[in-house]
């Protein structure tokens, strides 16, 4: 049994880091493998993660962590029984994938303005809480070409757009994702999408 693709890990910078790897053949990850992880920290204890299958030869492990600070560094040992298959380390602050925003809502009753709001996925005491920026994706269910991205570079989790920038009388969907420049993170997953029917009063034309 050998590791074909070494573990790569990403952290949500809160409580979970996710490590994925591939073996050289079909593997029952949960029965054959264990990923041991330990904070490089005087008198810390090692913890064991039981991996799950992620495709035939792929494995994934969700490492539970006590918060995350920038100095954190973990040692990782991948074991198959008594055999050490791989040894490495992981610094969560250097591999951050933020949690996805939630509770995306479209408010359509504000004088021909669409107000999109969502929730910051972090509690106020987490470092990322004040460092997230967002991308909002809006698309038409009827017209695949009608697909747009709005970059929200301020901290407030909301976006206002004129309803008239979208076509009237058709349904749209929106979703939002987050990233943090301070840690050069990857983008989060997209939030679940929300749907609304776009309608607005055409401006009265004067001749």
């Amino acid at each position: 049994m050998k590791v074909l693709q070494e573990p790569t890990c990403v952290s949500d910078y809160m409580s979970i880091s996710t490590c994925e790897w591939k073996m050289n053949g079909p593997t029952n990850c949960s029965t054959e493998l264990r990923l041991l992880y330990q904070l490089v920290f005087l008198l810390s204890e090692a913890h064991t993660c039981i991996p799950e299958n992620n495709g035939g030869a792929g494995c994934v492990c969700h490492l539970l962590m006590d918060d995350v600070v920038s100095a954190d560094n973990y040692t990782l040992d991948l074991w198959a029984g008594q055999q050490l298959l791989w040894k490495g380390s992981f610094k969560p602050s250097e591999h951050v994938k933020p949690r996805a925003p939630g509770n995306l809502t479209v408010h359509t009753n504000v004088s021909d303005t669409l107000l999109l709001t969502w929730s910051n996925p972090y509690p106020p005491d987490n470092y990322l809480y004040n460092h997230l920026t967002y991308a909002v994706n809006i698309w038409s269910e009827n017209d695949p070409a009608d697909f747009r991205i709005y970059n929200v570079t301020y901290l407030e989790p909301s976006l206002r757009i004129a309803a008239s920038t979208l076509k009237s009388g058709i349904s749209y969907r929106a979703r939002v994702r987050a990233w943090a420049q301070c840690y050069n993170t990857t983008w989060s997953e997209w939030s679940p999408s929300t749907k609304w029917h776009n309608s607005y009063r055409e401006p009265f034309e004067q001749h």
Partner: antibody, heavy 120, light 108 residues
Framework: EVQLLESGGGLVQPGGSLRLSCAAS????????MHWVRQAPGKGLEYVSG????????YYANSVKGRFTISRDNPKNTLFLQMSSLRAEDTAVYYC?????????????WGQGTTVTVSS | EIVLTQSPGTLSLSPGERATLSCRAS???????LAWYQQKPGQAPRLLIY???RRATGIPDRFSGSGSGTDFTLTISRLEPEDFAVYYC?????????FGQGTKLEIK
């Protein structure tokens, strides 16, 4: 209420021994690494020794290595420090301290301290 | 072994003023953690800041920590009468624990 209560301090002659105890209440000792920190009269804080939550690993400052032994009895929620070959410079208030991993070494609960005096 | 040096040794200020306490490490700190403690006469120390900048439970927001590498700072934005005490920085690393020698904050 989370509390640590040290006992076992006293007056001892140079070369003698003492065993300090620390009783924990209000939390489960087995979830935490535990440490001893001391403070000589009118001086600053000095780290002495620590033990991992399971008791499987220990650490000692160079000044006490080979003379002091830290141990724990998790079912009894008690921490110990066995001190031998005591010297005058070991005279101090000894604090039992809890370290929360989430606090990254921050010692969030301290006992009131027990005084050890080494003198002839 | 890393040595922590605190400065100044004594700081004399008045209530309402801003206090800035320094802690310098003899070598750079990457995978290690800095904490700050307050100690009043006859009492055990109290944890103020951990992980360089995070306030411990129940600590007022006038206390803040910052820094990286070798230089770390504890700032008390507006001194209250109860803040006059001795302050210690502490390094908790992979292989050792070290305290600074302390800074005494006294009323001017």
């Amino acid at each position: 209420e989370v509390q640590l209560l040290e006992s076992g301090g006293g007056l001892v002659q140079p070369g003698g021994s003492l065993r300090l105890s620390c009783a924990a209440s209000g939390f489960t000792l087995s979830s935490y690494a535990m440490h001893w920190v001391r403070q000589a009269p009118g001086k600053g804080l000095e780290y002495v020794s620590g033990i991992s939550s399971s008791g499987s690993s220990t650490y000692y400052a160079n000044s006490v290595k080979g003379r002091f032994t830290i141990s724990r009895d998790n079912p009894k929620n008690t921490l110990f420090l066995q001190m031998s070959s005591l010297r005058a410079e070991d005279t101090a208030v000894y604090y039992c301290v809890r370290v929360k991993v989430a606090y990254r070494g921050g010692m969030d609960v301290w006992g009131q301290g027990t005084t050890v005096t080494v003198s002839s | 072994e890393i040595v922590l040096t605190q400065s100044p040794g004594t700081l004399s200020l008045s209530p309402g003023e801003r206090a800035t306490l320094s802690c310098r490490a003899s070598q750079g700190i990457s995978s290690a953690y800095l904490a700050w403690y307050q100690q009043k006469p006859g009492q055990a120390p109290r944890l103020l800041i951990y992980g360089t900048s995070r306030r411990a439970t129940g600590i007022p927001d006038r206390f803040s920590g910052s820094g990286s590498g070798t230089d770390f700072t504890l700032t008390i934005s507006r001194l209250e009468p109860e803040d006059f005490a001795v302050y210690y920085c502490q390094l908790y690393g992979a292989t050792s624990v070290t305290f600074g020698q302390g800074t005494k904050l006294e009323i001017k």
